[in-house]
């Protein structure tokens, strides 16, 4: 066979679908690899061919499009399962070709089982809701293209095993689930089951997502440096270890990059010759506010080091702040024989 541009196995598209449900899978060539769409390819005389390799097999085989009730079919650049079976799991390849051109890509498809409470190995998308922010909605995801707009499906929403009917602050509204005022108690997995008719059969689409209630932008503040502060003085003798924590609180901000760093005499620790180590730890509150601690450590501090300026800096999308640590050399305790004796008036 002549050469074909093989894009290999596209593991970025690990497609998971539920057993015994319809699935529509677009050929990834047109979405990620080629600069033209299916319509252009088709009008240029290119043909889209599908085949697959079963799980735990090496043999590529054509897809059987002659199954009863057209269980597997192809429509333009979409491969349809109506519905899937567990043993449809495998690597699927779509190949676009004519006599002079060939391009193909493979992708893994995993058909997974769910239990009566919608638990499964499916990776769940996370939807973040702001705490106490007024009405917010989540929408039943990835159901476009399964049925025409003339078909009116029934949608049922669940939290775990339980149909949402009269929750205090959660209202099912068709494809949307409305949270009147999101609270921490609303954290969890929510499932929509979309039921629609097609050619005398009834199909179900199950979609589960995780809701995580996070800090509201209404309450967001610039970073707050708790340490160093004006109340603590780091007083050391030369030769001792100097440890200064920089502890910063960051309000949750969607897509914000939180940064903490130290400067010593205005320079980054990497840019100076002294032997400094910095260890960072991060913790999160239930609403994903973040506390970062960077501990600056000098194992054996010198009198020169104790004269330097140590400044903790923090930055988020809300602003930038800095705070200097109060570092000083400990005054040595008086030597009894001389200083104290003089103090008592001895001659």
């Amino acid at each position: 066979s002549e050469r074909c541009d093989d894009w290999g196995l596209d593991t970025m598209r690990q497609i998971q679908v539920f057993e015994d449900e319809p699935a529509r899978i677009k050929c990834p060539l047109f979405e990620h690899f080629l600069k033209f769409n299916y319509s252009t390819a088709h009008s240029a005389g290119l043909t889209l061919i599908w085949y697959w390799t079963r799980q735990d097999r090496d043999l590529e085989e054509p897809i059987n499009f002659r199954l009863p009730e057209n269980r597997i079919s192809k429509e333009k650049d979409v491969l349809w399962f109506r519905p899937t079976l567990l043993n449809d799991t495998g690597n699927y390849t779509c190949m676009l070709r004519n006599t002079t051109y060939c391009s193909k890509v493979a992708f893994p498809l995993e058909v997974v089982q769910k239990d009566s409470c919608f638990n499964s190995p499916m990776k769940l998308p996370v939807h973040k809701l702001y705490i106490e922010y007024g009405i917010q909605r989540i929408t039943c995801p990835n159901v476009d293209g399964y049925f025409p707009s003339s078909v009116k499906p029934t949608i049922t929403w669940y939290m775990g095993c339980y149909k949402i009917q009269n929750f205090n602050n959660v209202i099912p509204e068709g494809m949307n689930l409305s949270f009147l005022i999101a609270l921490i108690s609303n954290n969890g997995n929510y499932t929509c089951v979309v039921t629609y008719p097609e050619n005398g059969r009834t199909f179900h689409l199950t979609r589960t997502l995780t809701v995580k209630v996070v800090g509201s932008p209404k309450n967001a503040v610039p970073p707050v440096i708790h340490s160093p502060n004006d109340h603590v003085v780091y007083e050391k003798e030369p030769g001792e270890e100097l440890l200064i924590p920089c502890t910063v609180y960051f309000s949750f901000l969607m897509d914000s990059r939180n940064e903490v760093w130290w400067t010593i005499d205005g320079k980054k620790p990497d840019d100076i010759t002294i032997d400094v180590t910095i260890n960072e730890s991060i913790s999160h509150s239930r609403t994903e506010d973040e506390t970062r601690t960077q501990i600056l450590s000098i194992k054996k501090v010198t009198s020169e080091d104790l004269k330097r300026s140590y400044v903790c800096h923090a930055r988020s999308a809300k602003g930038e702040v800095a705070k200097a640590a109060k570092v000083k050399q400990k005054v040595p305790a008086p030597r009894y024989t001389v200083e104290l004796a003089c103090g008592f008036g001895a001659t």
């Epitope: 239990d115 009566s116 409470c117 939290m159 775990g160 095993c161 009269n166």
Partner: antibody
């Protein structure tokens, strides 16, 4: 370890109401549901309804609709089942039961209370 | 609602023997079936869920099988503490429903 402790036995007159309590101890923070099930003397188990205390959602078996009210007090981790217009055939042991979370398929009746005998007699 | 029918109503077995209890659903409940054990004066105890998964702390002599409408609970070698009433329950469709029970008594 989660435990459910129910209120003591009750003797009631026909036409009156009874309110049985079920207190959860050692509760995890996860939301859960409390189920109510009854068992008449020498008979099988009959599901009556449930409540999800954290969300206030209740659902009742058709048979008890209009006569049963399930409530919960989150602050004391206590659920209540009130049955009104009692008749002699309501004489039964009333159980509360729960799972660890809302997500445990098949384990929503994992932990049971000790049962409360309600006798309806004139 | 789904009706669960258990058979036999009473099963007489000698200690050490195998006991096989049946449960039939009026329509398919997939594998969404649980078994409970109840001793006199006690609350029921979950034995099996998902038709075949033993609950925490349940001895290996208890096993469940079946799917759809036909289910079986097997006690491989009856111990004295196993004489009790056993209930099946479906949790595939609301309302969740119990069978009427099978009493396992000493022969």
């Amino acid at each position: 370890q989660v435990q459910l402790v129910q209120s003591g036995a009750e003797v009631k007159k026909p036409g009156s109401s009874v309110k049985v309590s079920c207190k959860a101890s050692g509760s995890p923070a996860e939301p859960y549901a409390i189920q109510w099930v009854r068992q008449a003397p020498g008979q099988g188990l009959e599901w009556m309804g449930y409540i999800i205390p954290l969300h206030g959602q209740v659902d009742y078996a058709q048979k008890f609709q209009g006569r049963v009210t399930i409530t919960a007090d989150e602050s004391t981790s206590t659920a209540y089942m009130e049955l009104s217009s009692l008749r002699s055939e309501d004489t039964a042991v009333y159980y509360c039961a729960r799972g660890q979370t809302l997500y445990d398929s098949g384990r929503q009746f994992d932990i049971w209370g000790q049962g409360t005998l309600v006798t309806v007699s004139s | 609602e789904i009706v669960m029918t258990q058979s036999p109503a009473t099963l007489s077995v000698s200690p050490g023997e195998r006991a096989t209890l049946s449960c039939r659903a009026s329509q398919s409940v997939s594998s969404n079936l649980a078994w409970y054990q109840q001793k006199p004066g006690q609350a029921p105890r979950l034995l099996i869920y998902g038709a075949s998964t033993r609950a925490t702390g349940i001895p290996a002599r208890f096993s469940g099988s079946g799917s759809g409408t036909e289910f079986t609970l097997t006690i491989s070698s009856l111990q004295s503490e196993d004489f009790a009433v056993y209930y099946c329950q479906q949790y595939n469709n609301w309302p969740w429903t119990f069978g009427q029970g099978t009493k396992v008594e000493i022969k």
